[in-house]
Amino acid sequence: CKAMHVAQPAVVLASSRGIASFVCEYASPGKATEVRVTVLRQADSQVTEVCAATYMMGNELTFLDDSICTGTSSGNQVNLTIQGLRAMDTGLYICKVELMYPPPYYLGIGNGTQIYVIDPEPCPDSDF
């Protein structure tokens, strides 16, 4: 296993609809044709997998149908979107990139993006 640099933004604020997007960029050390991207969430010393996708270079990034993540890839840059976030989902979201094929295998883990989620205030009842 060889190390690889990964960069991602330090902080992102989710939209009022609970959607957060960020870029994950990696320093590819060679001609990888198969890449796996995983988003991990770290909160209270617990690390859980949020979503993962494997893609072939030049093809779309495909997450499972029931995933809360969507994304697109362009070169060594992945644009990730996480949906359905609530205030309780606030935490550090870490981008993990693996170059699966051809060998050698490379692994890169970003420093994480702190995603802040604020639940919208319910609208007051109107008299109209």
């Epitope: 640099h5 990964v6 960069a7 991602q8 870029v23 960029e25 990696y26 320093a27 590819s28 050390p29 060679g30 001609k31 990888a32 044709t33 270079m57 030049g58 070169g75 060594n76 840059q77």
Partner: nanobody, 126 residues
């Protein structure tokens, strides 16, 4: 859209040095990571070096590490490749390529670059 033009190639003796330039026009180069690649006759294109947008991140394959140095001058919209201790096996057409990125990293994979120059010939021979 950015366009790239390489220059500085030529004939040099083994052990000699050359400095290649990759000049950009049509867009500011500071938005792009830049890579140098080379292709010898009958061989696949091979990675040589890359540099991130700010210049703080560079990467090289083992074949040129310690001999080649990549640098950039964003005020001149140019990236340079300083090649020292040249060997016969360094003979090739050298291409620069650009990729628009958000952060400071760069890639040594030709698959990641979408804009390419026309190349400049480097011949190392006595």
């Amino acid at each position: 859209e950015v366009q790239l033009v390489e220059s500085g190639g030529g004939l040099v003796q083994p052990g000699g040095s050359l400095r290649l330039s990759c000049a950009a026009s049509g867009d500011t180069l500071e938005s792009f990571a830049v890579g140098w690649f080379r292709q010898a006759p009958g061989k696949e294109r091979e990675e040589v070096a890359c540099i991130g947008r700010t210049g703080e991140f560079t990467d090289y394959p083992g074949s040129v590490k310690g001999r080649f140095t990549i640098s950039r001058d964003n005020s001149k919209n140019t990236v340079y490749l300083q090649m020292n201790s040249l060997r016969a096996e360094d003979t090739a057409v050298y291409y620069c390529a650009a990729e628009r990125l958000v952060f400071h990293l760069c890639s040594l994979s030709e698959y990641d670059y979408d804009t390419w120059g026309q190349g400049t010939q480097v011949t190392v021979s006595s």
